[in-house]
Amino acid sequence: YDFTNCDFEKIKAAYLSTISKDLITYMSGTKSTEFNNTVSCSNRPHCLTEIQSLTFNPTAGCASLAKEMFAMKTKAALAIWCPGYSETQINATQAMKKRRKRKVTTNKCLEQVSQLQGLWRRFNRPLLKQQ
């Protein structure tokens, strides 16, 4: 999906009002310096691509983020403010097996959500030059 035509300010508002708090809740009990940010993005569409990938694509050691509150809010925000996104997700959902994954918080998941926090922060500061 090409995120170029999203309403970035609306997505930013959703992040600031709710998604950011859910990410903090998920990370509660973890030191902010515990994980190094290794994933970066260069502009808002690129950031959303990386955010979608880290949030919804299962990875080794962390297969359970899609059921978290921040993930559901992220998906809904993209569906509302990115034209055509919801249709791509509906089609993808219908091709998926209907299988409920048990929610498990692993250290790998915490690291992944830490990366997500960094991507979201970068998304909110699109005019900053990358280090």
């Epitope: 009002s17 559901m72 809010k73 998906k75 997700q89 509906i90």
Partner: nanobody, 114 residues
Framework: EVQLVESGGGLVQPGGSLRLSCAAS????????MGWFRQAPGKERELVSA???????YYADSVKGRFTISADNSKNTAYLQMNSLKPEDTAVYYC????????WGQGTLVTVSS
Amino acid sequence: EVQLVESGGGLVQPGGSLRLSCAASGCIFSTYFMGWFRQAPGKERELVSAIFSDGSTYYADSVKGRFTISADNSKNTAYLQMNSLKPEDTAVYYCALDWNLNRWGQGTLVTVSS
């Protein structure tokens, strides 16, 4: 197996109101994303409003200030109050619970016409 049943659609004049209901059965309605989608003839299905179990809500620009989404956990039911309806709101409206698991209702037709 989760079942979703929408009701409340119908024919209404421009400027009128309707209240859609979505009754969920066979599930626990406590940790959820609940969305109202709509699909107009020849168009893609679009998410117009969403509510989450913590009470936060999203609205598409086209309906903000006119539509209100809510949920009654005790009745396992979600609602979409639609005011100041416009002809462009004409569509089949679907509710979806936790759409990652493909839980969809059958849809209810809303026609706004004089």
